[in-house]
Amino acid sequence: IGLLYPFPRDCSQAMLNGDTTSGLYTIYINGDKTQALEVYCDMTSDGGGWIVFLRRKNGREDFYRNWKAYAAGFGDRREEFWLGLDNLSKITAQGQYELRVDLQDHGESAYAVYDRFSVGDAKSRYKLKVEGYSGTAGDSMNYHNGRSFSTYDKDTDSAITNCALSYKGAFWYKNCHRVNLMGRYGDNNHSQGVNWFHWKGHEYSIQFAEMKLRPSNFRNLEGRRKRA
């Protein structure tokens, strides 16, 4: 029996192929077999089908990196990693995607979902679009909507200072942040750590964070698969 999606363009299509276990999968940008990308798929959270593009969990990976590293991606996709801005830009150019952020700390958990999420191309300096919040973590990403990505060696924020340099991370900084998920792991100094302002504030570094995306119409696709 042939697969529904021989060259799945994201984790939702992998899931619709019958793959329901979270782990590493190969996806193909635009369904093009020459554009293969290994990703970690979360097949359990809120119905699954998510491409995980950021994970913080133990501080073993260095996230204070330059523009080139954030464009390309780094880390171990089973552990701490960043998928890469070039990849995010290509994936979100395939259609309408939603963003989910999962946060955990000492047995507490919170999440945020944004039903419209995209990352622009390199020319736009990977401009962020994030709209339509729901969840329990608080709408901290709202502040970063419309911003370009910033690293210590490419300062695109609107602050006098270099936000990435000041807060030892990288993000779609404005002046400077309400979200700093690429901050210094375990650093509880003001604004330096893994922060989600409307959940734990700026003086507490969150233990576990994941950012992930899937098509906004995933629920419809999932329903179609079940009926089939």
Epitope: N142, A159, H190
Partner: antibody, heavy 120, light 107 residues
Framework: QVQLVESGGGLVQPGRSLRLSCAAS????????MHWVRQAPGKGLEWVSG????????YYADSVKGRFTISRDNAKNSLYLQMNSLRAEDTALYYC?????????????WGQGTMVTVSS | DIQMTQSPSSLSASVGDRVTITCRAS??????LNWYQQKPGKAPKLLIY???NLETGVPSRFSGSGSGTDFTLTISSLQPEDFATYYC?????????FGQGTKVDIK
Amino acid sequence: QVQLVESGGGLVQPGRSLRLSCAASGFTFDDYAMHWVRQAPGKGLEWVSGISGSGGSTYYADSVKGRFTISRDNAKNSLYLQMNSLRAEDTALYYCAKSYQSDEDAFDIWGQGTMVTVSS
Amino acid sequence: DIQMTQSPSSLSASVGDRVTITCRASQYIQGFLNWYQQKPGKAPKLLIYDASNLETGVPSRFSGSGSGTDFTLTISSLQPEDFATYYCQQSYSTPQTFGQGTKVDIK
């Protein structure tokens, strides 16, 4: 052009209610959080309440919590402030203001204000 | 709540003077600081947002600086239309709070 016009102010007795309105034009109303800021005669500015673009999140100053309710009708490009159990200290010029980008942000557009006087 | 303290509360200056107004936050607020100008009988007008960004249409003689807890609004060469009251505001957290204002009048 971008404009905010407040209405609904007036003289009201303590303990009574009043509803302020703010009509917006010249921008995509539901893309922006909106706020009410007041200024007592001869005094400084005090933030009163705010609401997200969708209306899903609302925020209040402690001084008005439980008495005032902010709401919006995006179909009508309108913002409202329902003020109950009014007190003399609520006497002020009430301004409607647009958030620059996010819910907690600078206020880049202000209305001309509507005066609320609470007195017996 | 975050307290915002402006100084001075009033100042007298002449046309052409360089004027500096400071604003101090009671806690660290990164760069979430805005400045407004208000003339008698008028609504406030945004001058500077995010500590240092000049709002569109505002003359370049106005500038803002600072980060963390201490911020400054500078008017490089005071003009007749600049005599007004100036307010700082933190937008770091709710409730957003304003300074008590600085009145700039003619010497």
